[in-house]
């Protein structure tokens, strides 16, 4: 879930399952002022998604959007 | 608190290499991708390469076939290995890790032609 309220989204818990990566259109990282590292990803309808940056598919997802194998 | 703390750069010629490392500290590093970026003068920061935790990398097309990204869990450090170097690598190199908003100092590579 999200902070809606505060300027800066934090990661309180992460998503259980794997997001399918068609779905998945940008992504950000949370800030170092929330007490757990995060990966949001922005999905194609608009959906924010909290990720554990510590699973491997993350990782994947995250250099997919941004570097190529 | 993760600190990260990068080195190795310096002054090379076209077609030199450098071996840059980046030493971090206040996290087990095996868990999490690392990532390398670099930002030119005037330029924004771009991400070159990325190793997950698994071991699985990524390039920049700019970068691939000259950079190699590796890491080594025992010593919490990640390394770039660059080769081919051209003037248009001249930057300074960031790693980070992902999930952390946390950025070291840097380490300066100027490639002279």
């Known amino acids: 879930s999200l902070a809606a309220d505060t300027p800066t989204a934090c990661c309180f818990s992460y998503t259980s399952r794997q997001i399918p990566q068609n779905f998945i259109a940008d992504y950000f990282e949370t800030s170092s002022q929330c007490s757990k590292p995060g990966v949001i990803f922005l999905t194609k309808r608009s959906r924010q998604v909290c990720a554990d940056p510590s699973e491997e598919w993350v990782q994947k997802y995250v250099s997919d959007l941004e570097l190529s194998a | 608190e993760v600190q990260l703390v990068e080195s190795g750069g310096g002054l090379v010629q076209a077609g030199g290499s450098l071996r840059l490392s980046c030493a971090a500290s206040g996290i087990i590093t095996s868990r999490y991708a690392m990532h390398w970026y670099r930002q030119a003068p005037g330029e924004q920061r771009e991400l070159v390469a990325g190793?997950?935790?698994?071991?699985?990398?990524s390039y920049a097309d700019s970068v691939k076939g000259r950079f190699t990204i590796s890491r080594d869990n025992a010593k919490n450090t990640v390394y770039l290995q660059m080769n081919g170097l051209k003037p248009e690598d001249t930057a300074v190199y960031y790693c980070k890790v992902l999930g952390f908003d946390r950025w070291g100092q840097g380490t300066q590579v100027t490639v002279s032609s």
């Open positions: 190793i997950t935790s698994g071991g699985s990398t």
